[in-house]
Interface confidence: low
């Protein structure tokens, strides 16, 4: 037995860790550590996270729960999922809005704000994507409109003058 680097937990089960000086059973998700066990392999005293706080994982050391995040109204965020004892609030954007990341390398925890999706219909274009962010995300001009410069222009209803190709059904010669 010589040369053992240090003692290890030898309690039954796999949810014991050293808390202070003893091997203690930890607290389940949604609970915080009120007091550790007072004998080897004993149960810790665990209490449920108070309202508006949470702990997402089983734990042995958290003596207080984390405060639930508030969605940033200034950034037009809304709560997609409310906070529970075991999970933080999940913030996102309401329907018709998209997430615009505030940093270049965007990950799930990056700060963000919500931008309204482009209304392709108001631009007289087909809606090609669920949420268009730029004019170029929209489709071709709606029937009755034709491409002119960067936008869609209403087809002339008069048969006098030029009739753009896409407007033939509106202003072309009727056979």
């Amino acid at each position: 037995q010589g040369g053992t680097r240090s003692p290890r937990c030898d309690c039954a089960g796999d949810f014991h860790k050293k808390i202070g000086l003893f091997c203690c059973r930890g607290c389940p998700a949604g609970h915080y550590l009120k007091a550790p066990c007072t004998e080897p392999c004993g149960n810790s005293t665990c209490l449920v996270c108070p309202q508006d706080t949470f702990l997402a994982w089983e734990n042995h050391h958290n003596s207080e729960c984390a405060r639930c995040q508030a969605c940033d109204e200034q950034a037009s965020q809304v709560a997609l999922e409310n906070c529970s004892a075991v999970a933080d609030t999940r913030c996102g954007c309401k329907p018709g809005w998209f997430v615009e990341c505030q940093v270049s390398q965007c990950v799930s925890s990056s700060p963000f704000y919500c931008q309204p999706c482009l209304d392709c219909g108001a631009l007289h274009r087909h809606t090609r994507l669920l949420c268009s962010r730029r004019d170029t995300d929209c489709g071709t001009c709606l029937p009755g409109f034709y491409e002119h410069g960067d936008g869609c222009v209403s087809c002339p209803t008069s048969t006098l003058g030029s009739c753009p190709e896409r407007c033939a059904a509106v202003c072309g010669w009727r056979q």
Partner: antibody, heavy 121, light 115 residues
Framework: EVQLVESGGGLSQPGNSLQLSCEAS????????LNWVRQAPGKGLEWVAY????????SYADAVRGRFTISRDNAKNSLFLQMNNLKSEDTAMYYC??????????????WGQGTQVTVSS | QPVLTQSPSASASLSGSVKLTCTLS???????IVWYQQRPDKAPKYVMY???????SKGDGIPDRFSGSSSGAHRYLSISNVQSEDDATYFC?????????????FGSGTKVTVL
């Protein structure tokens, strides 16, 4: 090689303050709980204070609670003991002692060489 | 607080053997203790932890001459083939938790003299 080197001891008058330091090397400092243990001349060992690896759990012996403060700086591999309002009975050799990093049963598996604190008027 | 009791002294002949006792207060008879060796003017050194069932785990560099055993509230440290470097004071210690406070308590130590 695991090493714990205490410093900061010396002669102090009652009511004064001292800060002890323990510099660690040869192991992952931030993984380990740490303790201060003292030994008065010709006497046995007396536990003084405990701090967990991330400073989340701290505990003191009744004889020093309210006067001594244990702290650590994991970035600098250092443990500290701030000793205020010193008394003559605090005269002792002060050791820092490491707790094993692994979960489970306890031990103070490595000790420093100690630093002498003498409180006398 | 837990109480650990040790006899103050013991002697052993060179190459002989010696058995040291650490007695726990009765309500702690199933607890684990730790043995430490402290040579004169040196820091304590971790020898082993010792459980109530007698199983133990030794620290780095502790020779096979050192062994541990248990019986009820008694924890024993046995040294066989005693060498001059075993001349030291041996402390038993135990960690405890009380009202969310952590601590260590130590026995008064047994001074082993090698004759």
């Amino acid at each position: 090689e695991v090493q714990l080197v205490e410093s900061g001891g010396g002669l102090s008058q009652p009511g004064n303050s001292l800060q002890l330091s323990c510099e660690a090397s040869g192991f992952t400092f931030s993984n380990h709980d740490l303790n201060w243990v003292r030994q008065a001349p010709g006497k046995g060992l007396e536990w003084v204070a405990y701090i967990s690896s991330a400073s989340g759990l701290i505990s003191y012996a009744d004889a020093v609670r309210g006067r001594f403060t244990i702290s650590r700086d994991n970035a600098k591999n250092s443990l500290f003991l701030q000793m205020n309002n010193l008394k003559s009975e605090d005269t002792a050799m002060y050791y820092c002692a490491r707790d094993p990093a692994y979960t489970g049963l306890y031990a103070l598996d490595f000790w420093g060489q100690g630093t002498q604190v003498t409180v006398s008027s | 607080q837990p109480v650990l009791t040790q006899s103050p002294s013991a002697s052993a002949s060179l190459s002989g053997s010696v058995k040291l006792t650490c007695t726990l207060s009765s309500e702690l008879s199933n607890y684990t203790i730790v043995w430490y060796q402290q040579r004169p003017d040196k820091a304590p050194k971790y020898v082993m932890y010792l459980k109530s069932d007698g199983s133990h785990s030794k620290g780095d560099g502790i020779p096979d001459r050192f062994s541990g055993s248990s019986s009820g509230a008694h924890r024993y440290l046995s040294i066989s083939n005693v060498q001059s470097e075993d001349d030291a004071t041996y402390f038993c210690g135990m960690g405890y938790t009380l009202a969310n406070q952590y601590g260590w308590v130590f026995g008064s130590g047994t001074k082993v003299t090698v004759l």
